[in-house]
């Protein structure tokens, strides 16, 4: 793959990169005098990026990667938590090696806590990537989700429907899939907590609990799931909203809805 | 300058319990690091055995993880290993280290010999 | 658990180049870091977070990393450099440590 151009020396450390570049250079070789054909960014190792939650105890390194390419060459630029990420907005620094397209940064503390986002661009096109970082006490700890999941989804009535919920947790969690539902036209008890209705939860015939698979939808099965996660440590949960729409000129069909697991309850949320 | 001196009996039987200690000197044990014990039987490699960071937590290799205990002792600065039921297999040189993601700065080791 | 792989040994001429291995699974998305020792000393570090070099090793040592292998290369062999040498990550898929086997550089 072609080496990546250097941006601006402001996302250099101080210390060197004696990977940094090795191609003797940078520049396309033209055998013809014809510019090469352009390429937006594109991903060479998607495969190598799909962890995005990093749970990493305090004092080691993270070193996130973004291996990319395109012509002509692009640039890799940082940010953290969606602004530009200097040298100096963390103790010590950080290094951008470009040769690997990767950002390491050593003796990670709490404040590093956050989303990193690379972004990889040339003049005909950008893409970007974002990593979570969450910096923990050794394990037990409580369980950490993944940012952004479960994911709110909009789907036509009768799809299939999959949510995600990644889960970073020693000792080993309990992982539970919860619908908030309306008893009696109420959507809270009397003891002022929301009912809900328990889909999945791991322990019980659930091959992957971590994913929520929801066939043939029905419009009574729109509303807010929760992705709920403990250990005896503490817990921690997310949630997304399912709507399901159905065609404008089509007659609402008659379909009995049938609970995953039904199971109705007080809980807490 | 940090430095790191490891101290305990250079002589241990069977099925006794292995004790050592490291202090920690030229620098607090609280800062941002990892404790380490790092152990090498003779002719042979580096192995970890585990860590203790200033607020107790700790990890362990773990093939050693049921016979291993690391404490630290902030007041006095130091750091400790216990291996328990230790037989001839345990005979190395054992270093403690000072670790972030790798060991910057290493004891001069001690020997330990199990032997009746 | 993550496992290193080096060459048990490695020979080479004085002034030439040493080319030590490091194996392990996407090692590339780690960073690797390498050890020389001595006989009847404790191990120095030579290199840090793939190609880092501390202070006061010559530039000689420099490292790279990349897919399943993490390279130390020591250009223009002196005899003092003579040593076991050993590569470590911490892996973090475990939350553990974990050195390679070493490799034993014989000048010769």
């Known amino acids: 793959r072609p080496s990546p151009t250097l941006p601006e020396q402001d996302a250099l450390p101080s210390s060197e990169d004696d990977d940094d570049d090795d191609d003797s250079s940078s520049e396309e070789k033209e055998t013809d005098n014809t510019k090469p054909n352009p390429v937006a960014p594109y991903w060479t190792s998607p495969e190598k990026m799909e962890k995005k939650l990093h749970a990493v105890p305090a004092a080691k390194t993270v070193k996130f990667k973004c291996p990319s390419s395109g012509t002509p060459n692009p640039t890799l630029r940082w940010l953290k938590n969606g602004k530009e990420f200097k040298p100096d907005h963390r103790i010590g620094g950080y290094k951008v090696r470009y040769a690997t397209w990767s950002i390491i940064m050593d003796s990670v503390v709490p404040s590093d806590k956050g989303n990193y986002t690379c972004i990889v661009e040339n003049e005909y096109g950008s893409i970007n990537h974002t990593y979570q970082l969450d910096v923990v006490e050794r394990s037990p700890h409580r369980p950490i989700l993944q940012a952004g999941l479960p994911a709110n989804k909009t789907v036509a009535l009768g799809s299939n429907v999959e949510f995600m919920c990644k889960v970073y947790s020693d000792p080993q969690p309990h992982i539970q899939w919860l619908k908030h539902i309306e008893v009696n036209g109420s959507k809270i008890g009397p003891d002022n907590l929301p009912y809900v209705q328990i889909l999945k939860h791991s322990g019980i015939n659930s091959s992957d609990a971590e994913v929520l698979t929801l066939f043939n939808v029905t419009e009574a099965q729109s509303g807010e799931y929760v992705c709920k996660v403990s250990n005896y440590i503490g817990e921690a949960n997310q949630s997304a909203w399912l709507t399901v729409t159905r065609p404008a000129l089509e007659e609402r069909p008659a379909v009995m809805t049938s609970p995953l697991y039904l199971e109705h309850h007080h809980h807490h949320h | 300058q940090v430095q790191l001196q490891e101290s305990g009996p250079g002589l241990v039987k069977p099925s006794g319990t292995l004790s050592l200690t490291c202090a920690v000197s030229?620098?607090?044990?609280?800062?941002?690091?990892?404790w380490s014990w790092v152990r090498q039987p003779p002719g042979k490699g580096l192995e970890w055995i585990g860590e203790?960071?200033?607020?107790?937590?700790?990890s362990y290799n773990p093939s050693l993880k049921s016979r291993v205990t690391i404490s630290v002792d902030k007041s006095k600065n130091q750091f400790s290993l216990k291996l328990s039921s230790v037989t001839a297999a345990d005979t190395a040189v054992y270093y403690c280290?000072?670790?972030?993601?790798?060991?910057?700065?290493w004891g001069q080791g001690t020997l330990v010999t199990v032997s009746s | 658990s993550y496992v290193l792989t080096q060459p048990p040994s490695v020979s080479v001429a004085p002034g030439q180049t040493a080319r030590i291995t490091c194996g392990g699974n996407?090692?590339?998305?780690?960073?690797v870091h390498w050890y020389q020792q001595k006989p009847g000393q404790a191990p120095v570090l030579v290199v840090y977070?793939?190609?880092d070099r501390p202070s006061g090793i010559p530039e000689r040592f420099s490292g790279s990393n990349s897919g399943n292998t993490a390279t130390l290369t020591i250009s223009r062999v002196e005899a003092g450099d003579e040593a076991d040498y050993y590569c470590?990550?911490?892996?973090?898929?475990?939350?553990?440590?974990?050195f390679g086997g070493g490799t034993k550089l014989t000048v010769l």
């Open positions: 977070d793939d190609s």
């Open positions: 203790i960071y200033h607020s107790g937590s700790t």
């Open positions: 996407n090692i590339g998305s780690e960073s």
């Open positions: 470590q990550v911490w892996d973090s898929t475990s939350d553990h440590r974990v």
């Open positions: 030229g620098g607090s044990i609280s800062s941002n690091n990892w």
């Open positions: 280290a000072r670790a972030t993601d790798w060991f910057d700065l």
